[in-house]
Structures are given as structure tokens and as C-alpha cells.
Interface confidence: medium
Amino acid sequence: AVNGTSQFTCFYNSRANISCVWSQDGALQDTSCQVHAWPDRRRWNQTCELLPVSQASWACNLILGAPDSQKLTTVDIVTLRVLCREGVRWRVMAIQDFKPFENLRLMAPISLQVVHVETHRCNISWEISQASHYFERHLEFEARTLSPGHTWEEAPLLTLKQKQEWICLETLTPDTQYEFQVRVKPLQGEFTTWSPWSQPLAFRTKPAALGKDT
């Protein structure tokens, strides 16, 4: 039937990984499916097995090489196909021409650490992981701080419109436990999206000195 809905979405991490999600209403529960990558100007092909992530969606990672190797460029086009086994043959369930640098989602920032903490402020740094050198400085970041009694969704977003791998959080409350997360996005790419949020970094501000407010 033609009236079901289906989606095939993939992102390139800018180095050596293409992550894909295939979702389909009323999908083939017990069928073996895979994603096949077929570049237009490279000698390699790559496949990964789609594994269920929910009732009607499957995901897999095409590992193209060593994590920091630059396997694709801005001129590459990779034909991506979802293939599902039907008896003895494979049937094409979805197909697209994938332009890696138009569909970017970087890895979450790593190595978050408190550089300096005071009663009302905290300086935090991080690193980006497996990001292409092609970006040079053309990256932006979003950060958020979890305050006591609030949820992550309530936390205001702080935007850093340049490649700045540190932040100074101000107007914090003394002697209070906080958590901090950051994510990254290249400026390039029509369908580019934010990386996942980093692992939260927990920190505590210093208590106020007795008799004075610092």
C-alpha cells in the first residue's frame, strides 16, 4: 500500500561515521534490513545492519574508517539505500543521494571540566570530538545549566556564535549544586542539526564567606 508513512534520515559526523534511522508505519517486524552506502567517487562500499530502536524505527552506524579519518569531502555524494530481505533477495525500501556536508550532526562535546569556580561564577571548558578540520572556526555552541528544582527543558539556552570551547557562567548562587551541558553545530549544511548534548558536568559553587558577599 502506498498510504503508509516512512522516513529515512541520515547524518554525517564530519569524519568517518554516517548514522541512519529508518522508520516505517506497519513495518516488517521480523525482516532483516540494512543500510548500504555507495559513494559516487570512492572505491569503497559500506553496509550496516538496522537494529530496532522502537516499535517502528531502526538505526545503524556506517563506520567508514578510523574515528578521526576524513573519509568524505564536500564534493562527495553517497547513495544510501535501505535494503530488506524478501525471501532470497534484497528489496530496496528507500534510496537517497546523500550529501555528507549538507547533513551534518557532530559528536557531542567531550572532556568537560571546571577550570575555575567561585561563589557566583564558574568557568568551564570542553573539547569537540571527531570534527572535521574543514570547518576551521565555523562552529557554534549551545549551553545550558541545570539549577536546583528545575528540569533541563526549563534551562535557558546560552548561544555561543563562534568556536569558543569555554564559557564563564555568572550570577550563580553560592554553595549550590549545578549541572552543565553543551552541544555543537557546524554553520554549514542545509539539513545540518545540533549534536547530542554532552554528558552533564556537575559542579558546586563555593560558599559565601561569612559576613560578606563575594
Epitope: 516505517q24 528507500a94 534510496i95 543521494d97
Partner: nanobody
């Protein structure tokens, strides 16, 4: 907004040939997967074939395998469906569709549809 206009349909004798064309407006034609679908009287619309901008195609339904061929001219913003050895059961309205990625069948990602062109195969 991409507009798709099919042409080339008509009445043909069984065993004959037709070439359907689908002309697309828009500057990013080569970015789209282009597909042909058909809908016979009283039946659901069914997938026939798709071709990517890099001219890679999906597999064919057994009913048309070896008889139909898809091609595209990115410079002319046109996709073609060459149909040979036509049979009465190929009678249908043939539709052109475009999408960034084309699920085959369900059509969740179809972005644009043409109005269709009627192919009638008489015995």
C-alpha cells in the same frame, strides 16, 4: 516550489512502446530522487521505479522488469520512463514524483507529485 509535468501518455497497441517524460521546474533538480508510480483503474497507486541524481536506480517490480527503463537528464531537468512490450495490464495513470529520499513504497518523504499522464494499452 518544484512543479512536475508528465507527458507522453496515450493509446498504444499491446506489444508497442511509449516514452513518458516528466519535466521539473526548479534549480535543484539533481538533488532529488525522481520516481514513477502508476494507478490502474480501481487500484491503489503503486511504485514503479526511482532514480537518484547520480543515476542510481531502485530495483523493478517483477511485472515490469526488463520492459521498462528509467533515465534522467539533469541538464534538462527531465526524467524519462521508456516502456516496451506494453501489456493491457500496464494501463494506468502514470505519475512522476520527487523527494530528497524516496521510501519505496510508503510515500512519507514524497515532496512533489505531478498530475499524471494516462497510458492505455489495447489488446
Amino acid at each position: 516550489q518544484v512543479q512536475l509535468v508528465e507527458s507522453g501518455g496515450g493509446l498504444v497497441q499491446a506489444g508497442g512502446s511509449l516514452r513518458l517524460s516528466c519535466a521539473a521546474s526548479g534549480r535543484t533538480f539533481s538533488s532529488y530522487v525522481m520516481g514513477w508510480f502508476r494507478q490502474a483503474p480501481g487500484k491503489e497507486r503503486e511504485f514503479v521505479v526511482a532514480i537518484t541524481g547520480t543515476r542510481r536506480t531502485t530495483d523493478w517490480p517483477d511485472s515490469v522488469k526488463g520492459r521498462f527503463t528509467i533515465s534522467r537528464d539533469n541538464a534538462q531537468n527531465t526524467v524519462y520512463l521508456d516502456m516496451n512490450s506494453l501489456k493491457p495490464e500496464d494501463t494506468a495513470v502514470y505519475y512522476c514524483a520527487s523527494a530528497r529520499g524516496l521510501p519505496v513504497p510508503p510515500l512519507g518523504d514524497i515532496i512533489h507529485w505531478g498530475e499524471g499522464t494516462l497510458v492505455t494499452v489495447s489488446s
